[in-house]
Interface confidence: medium
């Protein structure tokens, strides 16, 4: 694929933010703010926490997710696995595109109760028009929004 | 906002590194280097650890602060606050734009009391001409500084 | 030096994916896929190990590497460190870029002795045609390869 | 609705052992940590200890020597022991739900039980 | 242990009034940070969680802010209802600890 960045044309760029309804405990991926604040949409929409693309081409993605918690939740393996995922209706399952695992539960000290950890996650990939990309969290329980500044999911044509 | 990258225009850019002088103890922002080795400024200006915007438009702004210890100064709240913040003539406050906070001091192993960690921060946020990017870490005692690689501070126009 | 960006010009960027090839335990870099599943070369090219760049310019370059284990191997420092680096036939050594380090093996839970981290690194640095940029871990040993979703290697130009 | 029904001896002579159970009526046990806090006569508030969700337990170091907090979770029910009470351990001694929001922290107390008046005397 | 200085730590004021009350922590506790109101013989009651968040069922006359080492709860419009003792408390840190309590009495 040949992909040029025309001069007259705006490059679609987004940065969707967490709100208290990221968090639905359904299984399903995380839900953003899209228009309130630092969020904004350019050149691409979004559907139930989704990223829908409009302009095939290579985007570099990003999400940030803020972890915090008091020990562990029971029952919670010890492992967050943080991703960004790909629909696409050629395919009936949603793709892994960047994913990270994380312990950060062992991150309290003896002295606090509290703790916190963030991961982070960026890289380009090719989309196509009408492809979706959404943010999952499993163990979402451990998630901590709080203003839209601490977790997060974007991207931007490159 | 219509927003459109002009072939004959510089795309603003920037790289700012870590230096000797940038943990300043007075509770104000990181300092950083702008022309020596990897630091360079391209469409962008700089003040007293802010870049400054000159050209409104979307930007990916990015932030990498290390952090390192032997356990944790007396005092030290187990989290560490990495921020970018805006700083704009419209408003008195900092804004935050996109902020993690971390509990690394739990990060020492049984063997070893000496703690190493790293917080990356990046996304797209919408700059007017005139306004500031700024870099916080409280508390700026666990950065580690050594050669502009390992805590930095960037942006570019999407 | 002034860059443009030309419209009718393909903008250059490239993400590599770990495979089980990558970690060589030889000394040297880590290899990465370059054609299957999410791997791309656009305006780039490969050769052991490096993303060379064809066009000079200012580019954002990305890392990240799965870290993971069971405790920590015998012998191994607390400290992993995870950087991107410059090669130039100006000069004979590698030159750091990018570089985080980390204290993983702390993460442990006291009911899970399994462990599980991420690095991620990211910025623009300018690149002359011909510079390489490889990416490197020490300890490697640690570094968990799967799928080519968790450790990853990319850049496109700014 | 969440409650909290405690219940306990209420009078006690020194050296003797302090013992009370707190059950959990309407809400679920499991993700939840749970607190013991005592108020003295006329006094403030004196956090005793936790049973976390995880089921580790964490005491107030002017009383861990003496103090040990259990839990029954197939009976829904969590229990205080409190070790050579003196007339120092005179209070209202409250079981404590710690709030678990989905996207916050969990830095709150929001379920109380009724209080269980406990006097040490000669 | 976190020291939790309240201040004040009694206040007259009347109906209708704004109240403001601060708690100074000796060291950073980000926002792991609540709120209580108790009245005499009964249970206390949580106000605020999370340093900001306002409780289910409290009205919305009650706010809270702060992060780090100062906080302050905020009764905009004060009701007969209102008069009470009031405490805070922070979970950052073991042993989690209370503010000694602000008593709001009627003017």
């Known amino acids: 694929l040949i992909q040029e960045r025309r001069s007259h044309e705006v490059n679609p760029a987004a940065h969707l933010t967490g709100a208290n309804s990221s968090l639905t405990g359904s299984g399903g991926p995380l839900l953003w703010e899209t228009q309130l604040g630092l969020a904004f949409l350019r050149g691409l929409s979004y559907h139930d926490g989704a990223l829908v693309v409009t302009k095939a081409g290579y985007y570099y993605i990003y999400s940030k997710v803020q972890l915090g918690g008091v020990g562990c939740p029971l029952g919670l393996a010890s492992t967050i696995t943080h991703g960004l995922y790909k629909r696409t209706p050629r395919y009936p399952e949603e793709l892994e595109l960047l994913v990270s695992q994380q312990s950060p539960c062992g991150r309290a000290t003896s002295s606090s109760r509290v703790w916190w950890d963030s991961s982070f996650l960026g890289g380009v990939v090719h989309l196509e028009a009408g492809e979706e990309v959404v943010v999952r969290v499993l163990d979402e329980r451990l998630v901590r929004l709080r203003d839209g500044t601490r977790s997060y999911f974007g991207a931007f044509m490159v | 906002l219509i927003q459109e990258r002009r072939s004959h225009e510089v795309n603003p850019a920037a790289h700012l590194t870590g230096a000797n002088s940038s943990l300043t103890g007075s509770g104000g922002p990181l300092l950083w280097e702008t022309q020596l080795g990897l630091a360079f400024l391209r469409g962008l200006s700089y003040h007293d650890g802010a870049l400054v915007v000159t050209k409104a438009g979307y930007y990916y702004i990015y932030s990498k602060v290390q952090l390192g210890g032997v356990g944790c100064p007396l005092g030290l709240a187990s989290t560490i606050t990495h921020g970018l913040y805006k700083r704009t003539p419209r408003y008195p406050e900092e804004l935050e734009l996109l902020v993690s906070q971390q509990s690394p001091c739990g990060r020492a192993t049984s063997s070893s009391r000496v703690w190493w960690d790293s917080s990356f921060l990046g996304g797209v946020v919408h700059l007017e001409a005139g306004e500031e990017v700024v870099v916080r870490v409280l508390d700026e005692r666990l950065v580690r500084l050594r050669d502009g690689t390992r805590s930095y501070f960037g942006a570019f126009m999407v | 030096l002034i860059q443009e960006r030309r419209s009718h010009e393909v903008n250059p960027a490239a993400h590599l994916t770990g495979a089980n090839s990558s970690l060589t335990g030889s000394g040297g870099p880590l290899l990465w896929e370059t054609q299957l599943g999410l791997a791309f070369l656009r305006g780039l090219s490969y050769h052991d190990g490096a993303l060379v760049v064809t066009k000079a310019g200012y580019y954002y370059i990305y890392s990240k590497v799965q870290l993971g284990g069971v405790g920590c191997p015998l012998g191994l420092a607390s400290t992993i460190t995870h950087g991107l680096y410059k090669r130039t036939p100006r000069y004979p050594e590698e030159l750091e870029l990018l570089v985080s380090q980390q204290s993983p093996c702390g993460r442990a839970t006291s009911s899970s002795r399994v462990w599980w981290d991420s690095s991620f690194l990211g910025g623009v640095v300018h690149l002359e045609a011909g510079e390489e940029v490889v990416v490197r871990v020490l300890d490697e040993r640690l570094v968990r390869l799967r799928d080519g979703t968790r450790s990853y290697f990319g850049a496109f130009m700014v | 609705q969440v409650q909290l029904q405690q219940w306990g001896a209420g009078l006690l002579k020194p050296s003797e052992t302090l013992s009370l159970t707190c059950a959990v009526y309407?809400?679920?046990?499991?993700?939840?940590?749970w607190h013991w806090i005592r108020q003295p006569p006329g006094k403030g508030l004196e956090w005793i200890g936790e049973?976390?969700?995880?089921?580790?337990?964490n005491y107030n170091p002017s009383l861990k020597s003496r103090v040990t907090i259990s839990v029954d979770t197939s009976k829904n029910q969590f229990s205080l022991k409190l070790s050579s009470v003196t007339a120092a351990d005179t209070a209202v001694y409250y079981c404590?739900?710690?709030?678990?929001?989905?996207?916050?922290?969990?830095?709150?107390?929001?379920?109380w039980g009724q209080g269980t008046t406990v006097t040490v005397s000669s | 242990a976190i020291q939790l200085t309240q201040s004040p730590s009694s206040l007259s004021a009347s109906v209708g009034d704004r109240v403001t009350i601060t708690c100074r922590a000796s060291?950073?506790?980000?926002?792991?940070f609540a709120w209580y109101q108790q009245k005499p013989g009964k249970a206390p009651k949580l106000l605020i969680y999370?340093?900001?968040s306002l409780e289910s069922g409290v009205p919305s006359r009650f706010s809270g802010s702060g992060s780090g080492t100062d906080f302050t709860l905020t009764i905009s419009s004060l009701q007969p209802e209102d008069f009470a003792t009031y405490y805070c408390?922070?979970?950052?840190?073991?042993?989690?600890?209370f503010g000694g309590g602000t008593k709001v009495e009627i003017k």
């Open positions: 309407g809400g679920s046990f499991s993700g939840y940590n």
């Open positions: 049973i976390t969700h995880s089921g580790s337990t």
């Open positions: 408390q922070q979970f950052n840190s073991y042993p989690l600890t």
């Open positions: 999370d340093a900001s």
């Open positions: 404590v739900r710690e709030i678990a929001v989905a996207g916050t922290g969990y830095y709150g107390m929001d379920v």
């Open positions: 060291q950073g506790i980000n926002s792991a």
